[in-house]
Amino acid sequence: PPNRRTCVFFEAPGVRGSTKTLGELLDTGTELPRAIRCLYSRCCFGIWNLTQDRAQVEMQGCRDSDEPGCESLHCDPSPRAHPSPGSTLFTCSCGTDFCNANYSHLPPPGSPGTPGSQGPQAAPGESIWMAL
């Protein structure tokens, strides 16, 4: 259908770079969560930083193009990078409105499928773009 995709938009303080121009921020009448209407794709993304005790959202928004994973109805994150020892960045892509608001499931740190702790390390901020 020709309707444009609408996603949750969030960028944690201190994150370098922005995906704000990949869509049009909407006035939804509430301060949070913010919504963004995608310009160049029908695909939302989310990035969460999983540490031993909690998962913290880093970024949510629109992707710049449709690609594998965007056909998913729900946000099913996959491990992508290690910003620091003991933490893992998980990302998802999905193709329904607000599908990136939350993830369906995150594997526990160190479980099979999670990159080993000896994996590549990235400087804070750089790791977000590695994950994208």
């Epitope: 020709p2 309707n3 444009r4 609408t6 121009t21 049009e24 909407l26 006035d27 939804t28 009448g29 919504a35 209407r37 310009l39 160049y40 794709s41 710049d64 193009s65």
Partner: antibody
Framework: QLQLQESGPGLVKPSETLSLTCTVS?????????WNWIRQPPGKGLEWMGY???????SYNPSLKSRITISRDTSKNQFSLKLSSVTAADTAVYYC??????????WGQGTLVTVSS | DIVLTQSPGTLSVSPGERATLSCSAS??????????MHWYQQKPGQPPKLLIY???SLESGIPVRFSGSGSRTDFTLTISRVEAEDFAVYYC?????????FGGGTKLEIK
């Protein structure tokens, strides 16, 4: 100051391919936003044809999808339009324009392309 | 495709008068209460010029006598006091759905 300038043949024969280039100065086409082609038949309204985004994503008007190709040359900061199998109905002023989000804030001056044998 | 119908086709006003131009969409151009309708002015031999975006936001450098309003399917461009330089053709454009579409235009002429 951002400027866009269309160039290409002003006369194209029926059934041939119309080719136009838009040269952008004052802004990199790989920095942000989308780069569009819009046309206007003489004395008529405007028709959005398609865009190529800063990242290379492409979107076409379905009414033209089988005939249109938009591409870019990032080294020259240019983007181009090809429209195949043209007829007299494709006679128009062709504009290139930048879309800031989903509206058009910078336009070229336009170039008239006439389809005639 | 969303069809935009502008009325009247031609509007005759005297300088200093108020001008009201309408644009009606075949279906809503709103997303979660946000209207994706934009207005342009075009003079002979020139490209269109952006006046209003997202129904009511005035583009930088455009005189405040121009204003936009409306939601869903019905939108209005108002020129509070028409000046000589305002006589031109005005187009609305929607971007709520692909493909982007334009209205047929309203010609504002001197009465």
């Amino acid at each position: 100051q951002l400027q866009l300038q269309e160039s290409g043949p002003g006369l194209v024969k029926p059934s041939e391919t119309l080719s136009l280039t838009c040269t952008v100065s004052g802004y990199s086409i790989t920095s942000d936003y989308a780069w569009n082609w819009i046309r206007q038949p003489p004395g008529k309204g405007l028709e959005w044809m398609g865009y190529i985004s800063y990242s290379g994503s492409i979107s076409y008007n379905p009414s033209l999808k089988s005939r249109i190709t938009i591409s870019r040359d990032t080294s020259k900061n240019q983007f181009s339009l090809k429209l195949s199998s043209v007829t007299a109905a494709d006679t128009a002023v062709y504009y290139c324009a930048r879309s800031r989000y989903s509206w058009f804030d910078y336009w070229g001056q336009g170039t008239l392309v006439t389809v005639s044998s | 495709d969303i069809v935009l119908t502008q009325s009247p086709g031609t509007l005759s006003v005297s300088p200093g008068e108020r001008a009201t131009l309408s644009c009606s969409a075949s279906e809503s151009v709103d997303t979660y209460g946000n209207s994706f309708m934009h207005w342009y002015q075009q003079k002979p031999g020139q490209p269109p010029k952006l006046l209003i975006y997202r129904a009511s936001s005035l583009e930088s450098g455009i005189p405040v006598r121009f204003s936009g309003s409306g939601s869903r399917t019905d939108f209005t461009l108002t020129i509070s006091r028409v000046e000589a330089e305002d006589f031109a053709v005005y187009y609305c454009q929607q971007s709520n759905e692909d493909p982007y579409t334009f209205g047929g235009g309203t010609k504002l002429e001197i009465k």
